[in-house]
């Protein structure tokens, strides 16, 4: 994991990387498996009642760089990682929540395995 | 240069298992999947599955799920596929093929007879 | 699964003539990352296949520049703009979006 906010995403693949996909399966997906030429991310955030929902799949090389970041948006809660080492690396991952403060909001590092 | 070495044939009897290899060379064998293909004479393509190397993850053709079974070898960049059960309608020409997001190299192709 | 539909099965052409393929998919080849994964391969008599067109119009390594890729979506063509005596064979379209992989059944180019 890199942390203290570097902002370099996980190197991508020279080959298509398989991932588990839940709630954000494209239509090209098989058996809850999407492909993608950059990464397999885990995200966890709060839905409008508060609960926390944890959606999982693929992300295109193009623009993940900036969505494996972990940018703290306003008055919403989430977290996200991202991982490219194996097919369905992101069954590993595991993003928590990040603590309420205030509903105030810190840069926040970036996530990945 | 890549070279994806095959056995030229194979001759098995009904109801038996083959094992067909599959030697890699000329690049690093675990920065590619690995497919097979299947040509019945005068026919078309068909799609196995495929094994990626790295992490010995397998997808099948849903069509081929308990006929064929993809294995390799990292040590040797050898990569297998295990035909079971076999039947006059799995003699054909099998093909391995080198996968990042499409086919690039072909083995020569191992022809497979199978013959009581 | 998806269907590629080859026409015509059969071509057959004088040498120095242009010749023409279509392939059909029954559903958009589109990935979700955007890309195509469409790809055309030349099947020659007693060998495997060998890659000619990557991705809807990208020229595998020496393959010389009278091959032409076109299309999108569902749609593609495969243009030989003068025919050589070493482009006689089998043509293969070829999908890699969706699992299961397919193939087109194979536009045989020969000489009339």
């Known amino acids: 994991k890199k942390e203290d906010g570097e902002s370099t995403a996980p190197t991508p693949r020279p080959k298509v990387l398989r991932c588990k996909c839940h709630h954000h399966c494209p239509e090209d997906s098989v058996n809850n498996i999407c492909s993608t030429d950059g990464y397999c991310f885990t995200m966890i955030e709060e839905d409008d009642s508060g609960l926390p929902v944890v959606t999982s799949g693929c992300l295109g090389l193009e623009g993940s760089d900036f969505q494996c970041r972990d940018t703290p948006i306003p008055h919403q809660r989430r977290s996200i990682e991202c991982c490219t080492e194996r097919n369905e690396c992101n069954k590993d991952l595991h993003p928590t929540l990040p603590p309420l403060k205030n509903r105030d909001f810190v840069d926040g590092p970036i996530h990945h395995r | 240069q890549v070279q994806l070495l095959q056995p030229g044939a194979e001759l098995v009897k009904p109801g038996s298992s083959v094992k067909v290899s599959c030697k890699a060379s000329?690049?690093?064998?675990?920065?590619?999947?690995m497919q097979w293909v299947k040509q019945r004479p005068g026919q078309g393509l068909e799609w196995i599955g495929e094994i990626d190397p790295s992490d010995t993850y397998t997808l099948y053709n849903q069509k081929f799920k308990g006929k064929a079974t993809l294995t390799v070898d990292t040590s040797s960049s050898t990569a297998y596929m295990q035909l079971s059960s076999l039947t006059s309608e799995d003699s054909a020409v099998y093909y391995c093929?080198?996968?990042?997001?499409?086919?690039?190299?072909w083995g020569q192709g191992t022809t497979l007879t199978v013959s009581s | 699964d998806v269907v590629m539909t080859q026409t015509p099965l059969s071509l057959p052409v004088s040498l120095g003539d242009q010749a023409s393929i279509s392939c059909r998919s029954s559903?958009?080849?589109?990935?979700?990352?955007?890309?195509?994964?469409f790809h055309w391969y030349l099947q020659k008599p007693g060998q495997s296949p060998e890659l000619l067109i990557y991705?809807?119009?990208n020229r595998f390594s020496g393959v010389p520049d009278r091959f032409r890729g076109s299309g999108s979506g569902t749609d593609f063509t495969l243009k030989i703009s003068r025919v050589e005596a070493e482009d006689l064979g089998v043509y293969f379209c070829?999908?890699?979006?969706?699992?299961?992989?397919?193939f087109g059944s194979g536009t045989k180019l020969e000489i009339k």
């Open positions: 559903q958009s080849l589109v990935h979700s990352t955007g890309n195509t994964y």
């Open positions: 991705k809807v119009s």
């Open positions: 093929a080198r996968f990042g997001y499409y086919v690039d190299y």
């Open positions: 000329g690049y690093t064998f675990t920065n590619y999947w």
């Open positions: 070829s999908q890699s979006t969706h699992v299961p992989f397919t």
